[in-house]
């Protein structure tokens, strides 16, 4: 059988280093050998690249070499497999060295911040060596903060007369460290170089971007003050390096300005004591560039009537995210305040909140959020400066079954009754909602009965028992991860009634 | 037997024009390159034209440019020799030769050098341009 | 284009005795693409030496080359009665290809 036809040829051309082509098929059944014809100096001179030894043979590859690599050049290429059956010749393909030369990747030495020009990083590299030194070279930029798995690209030119190998990459976020490599490509060419080796810069510090500011309003003091939890962070987009020196806060009663009070705290909570009247809450952080803008939040007064507009809200876990969606009947609000705790017995060690626009939902990803925690989740609706109704519900990320089960006790045993009564698991031994509770119990020597019952009961009578018999009883609680069981009791049924 | 045979060659007044054919015989044609060559009565020899394997032109002599075509039919055989607004001093034996085929010259290794020479000839046609 | 200009232009040897042509190029020529042949009387052309040094299926041993860069010679170690003819040196390093004007070989 004749070799297949060699086709789908393709070919490079490694600047200085080799004019290599491939085509298909990559393996023949029996042996085979191929032969790449080829001429250059624009059809002038001929020669060929052949695979005829049995340590190449059936390698769909071959590869011209210096001296004969002429540049710039118009090659044809043809490629012969042959077996011991006979040839097969491809189709002549023809091949613009300038449209098919791959370089070697420049080298980045600099990524710097130019004095005085903020969000702003000159890049400095040297031209690759193995280049043509009269070609115009295409450039792709890429770049990325640090901390992002998402690059960017810009594209430029270059003109080799220009020997200014640099690229001022503008409209960065201020004072952030920002990775870049580099590619580069002739002009007129389809393959790129590989990527230079990467390196980092730091665009200028300038005064802080800004806070996101709220709050936690606790119930009134015995002495009507109110005391107000306020809580600020960078504000999103905010430069990662971004350091605040302090923070400035004023505040007084609406229409009252004379009555502004300020602190000053390098925290970044405060707690306010505030009567009873609406007050207005003014941020600002500094650093040694100057201060930030200012961030604002109205306290309402401790009668005001709060407006509510969610209707109802779902929490559902994806593969990595827990999402939280909410429906409203309010189409003005596009403002949310989301506030995430875990629901532990004691005070919260981590109270974490974070502001939604123009969305209805709110995700986070799985692993920032302990498994087996339960977290409540509230949200409030934010319309301009009001802060409404929070509607809330509670999440857990991963459930397991409960640490521990119900402590359980028996009363009131009669004849053939007895009520059993057990305990809430404490939330930290929970693990996971509790769906039901499973009442096991068993006569000596006896089959074991059940009997499973909703979550909010927390109490069962159980009925047809046999008088005067000890019977042993324990109380499971489960979760959607399963079950587990609470201490083992006895009891003994009495042989009489006892009035 | 590899062997050339031209044909073509006439008596043509000054400004008239020729086509000149060589057919190939003996070797697989389409892994050659062709040249014609031609000589002067009693003067040596002059390199005219060539075409490669693949059909592209490799050049012609400075005195032939812009009036002198050089073409291949692989599926014929044959290498043509188009002569236009002829001159007297076009009056030659035209030779169609054969280029080096493509081998020789291993350099060790998978690539080959290409030796070049003109390794086969034919008998020649004689073109006379007068009036 | 390179001109290549062949001395003698004629040479009469002695059977047995020694020949040697020079072929000097205007411009530098790669040795692989310097090519000499023999044009017997009354015949087509043939191949002598390519590759400067390469001597072509079936040719004497008598036959030799040498030279590189813009100088290269053909020696005739013994000269025989068979060798009568025109010598011409051919350059194809660059476009157009050029002979020389040749060296007619006799024997005295």
């Known amino acids: 059988v004749l070799p297949a036809k060699p086709e789908n040829i393709s070919c490079i051309f490694y600047y200085e280093e080799n004019f290599t082509c491939t085509w298909s098929p990559e393996k023949e059944a029996s042996y085979t050998w191929y032969k790449v014809k080829r001429t250059y100096s624009y059809g002038y001179k001929s020669d060929i690249c052949s695979t005829d030894n049995s340590t190449r043979g059936n390698h769909a590859s071959c590869s011209f070499l210096p001296p004969t690599i002429t540049n710039p050049d118009n090659y044809t290429i043809q490629v012969e497999a042959q077996n011991a059956d006979g040839i097969m010749k491809s189709d002549i393909t023809y091949w613009n060295l300038d449209a098919i030369m791959k370089i070697e990747p420049p080298e980045i030495f600099s990524v710097k911040s130019v004095l005085g020009i903020k969000r702003m990083l000159q890049i400095k590299w040297i031209r690759p060596v193995l280049a043509p030194h009269s070609s115009t070279l295409k450039y792709t930029l890429r770049f990325r903060t640090i901390n992002s798995a998402y690059w960017m690209e810009v594209n430029f030119t270059k003109e080799d007369i220009d020997r200014d190998e640099t690229y001022n990459l503008t409209e960065l976020q201020a004072f952030t460290e920002y990775v870049m490599t580099l590619r580069c490509a002739p002009a007129e060419s389809m393959f790129w170089s590989g990527w230079s080796q990467e390196k980092v810069g730091t665009t200028e510090e300038e005064a802080p971007y800004g806070l996101d500011l709220w709050r936690v309003l606790k119930p009134a003091m015995v002495d009507g003050r109110r005391p107000v939890q306020l809580m600020w962070k960078k504000a999103t987009g905010a430069p990662v390096l971004e350091k605040a020196l302090g923070y400035n806060i004023w505040y007084f009663p609406e229409n009252n300005t004379n009555l502004t009070e300020t602190v000053n705290t390098t925290n970044q909570t405060h707690e306010l004591y505030l009567g009873g009247k609406t007050y207005w809450v003014y941020v600002v952080s500094y650093n040694s560039l100057g201060e930030s803008p200012v961030a604002t939040l109205r306290i309402p007064a401790l009668n005001e009537k709060t407006f509510q507009c969610i209707e109802a809200m779902q929490a559902c876990l994806t593969q990595d995210q827990l999402v939280v969606e909410w429906q409203s009947s309010a189409p003005e609000v596009d403002t949310w305040m989301v506030e995430w705790f875990p629901d532990v017995d004691s005070e919260p060690s981590s109270f974490s909140w974070e502001s939604v626009s123009q969305a209805r939902n709110w995700t986070i990803q799985k692993d920032e959020l302990k498994p087996l925690w339960c977290y409540n989740i509230s949200v409030y609706p934010v319309l301009r400066d009001r802060v409404g109704q929070p509607y809330s519900t509670q999440a857990y990320v991963q459930e397991g079954i409960p640490s521990a089960g119900p402590v359980t006790q028996a009363d009131s045993i009669g004849v053939k009754t007895v009520t059993i009564t057990w305990k809430e698991i404490p939330k930290s031994k929970r693990n996971g909602f509790i769906k039901n509770y499973t009442i096991f119990y068993q006569a000596e020597d006896g089959k074991e009965f059940s009997k499973t019952v909703n979550s909010n009961i927390l109490q069962y009578r159980l009925e047809s028992l046999t008088r005067r018999t000890s019977y042993s009883l324990q109380v499971m609680a489960s979760t959607n991860a399963g079950g587990t069981n609470g201490t083992k009791i006895n009891f003994k049924t009495l042989s009489i009634s006892v009035l | 037997e590899v062997q050339l045979v031209e044909s073509g060659g006439d008596l043509v007044k000054p400004g008239g024009s020729l086509r000149l054919s060589c057919v190939a015989s003996?070797?697989?044609?389409?892994?050659?390159?062709m040249s014609w060559v031609r000589q002067a009565p009693g003067k040596g020899l002059q390199w005219v034209s060539g075409i490669n394997w693949a059909g592209g032109t490799i050049g012609y002599a400075d005195a032939v440019k812009g009036r002198f075509t050089i073409s291949r039919d692989n599926a014929r055989n044959t290498v043509y020799l188009q002569m236009n607004s002829l001159r007297a001093e076009d009056t030659a034996v035209y030779y169609c030769?054969?280029?080096?085929?493509?081998?020789?010259?291993?350099?060790?290794?998978?690539?080959?050098?290409?030796?070049?020479?003109?390794?086969?000839w034919g008998q020649g046609t004689l073109v006379t341009v007068s009036s | 284009e390179v001109v290549m200009i062949q001395t003698p232009l004629s040479l009469s040897v002695s059977p047995g005795e020694p020949a040697s042509i020079s072929c000097r190029a205007s411009?530098?020529?790669?040795?692989?693409?310097l090519v000499w042949y023999l044009q017997k009387p009354g015949q087509s052309p043939q191949l002598l030496i390519y590759?400067?040094?390469s001597r072509a299926t079936g040719v004497s041993d008598r036959f030799s080359g040498s030279g590189s860069g813009t100088d290269f010679t053909l020696r005739i170690s013994r000269v025989e009665a068979e060798d009568v003819g025109v010598y011409y040196c051919?350059?194809?390093?660059?476009?157009?290809?050029?002979f020389g004007q040749g060296t007619k070989v006799e024997i005295k």
């Open positions: 030769a054969r280029e080096s085929p493509l081998r020789l010259g291993d350099l060790g290794g998978d690539y080959f050098y290409y030796y070049y020479y003109l390794d086969v």
């Open positions: 003996g070797f697989t044609f389409d892994d050659y390159g």
């Open positions: 051919q350059q194809y390093d660059n476009s157009p290809r050029t």
């Open positions: 411009q530098s020529v790669s040795s692989r693409y």
């Open positions: 590759g400067t040094s």
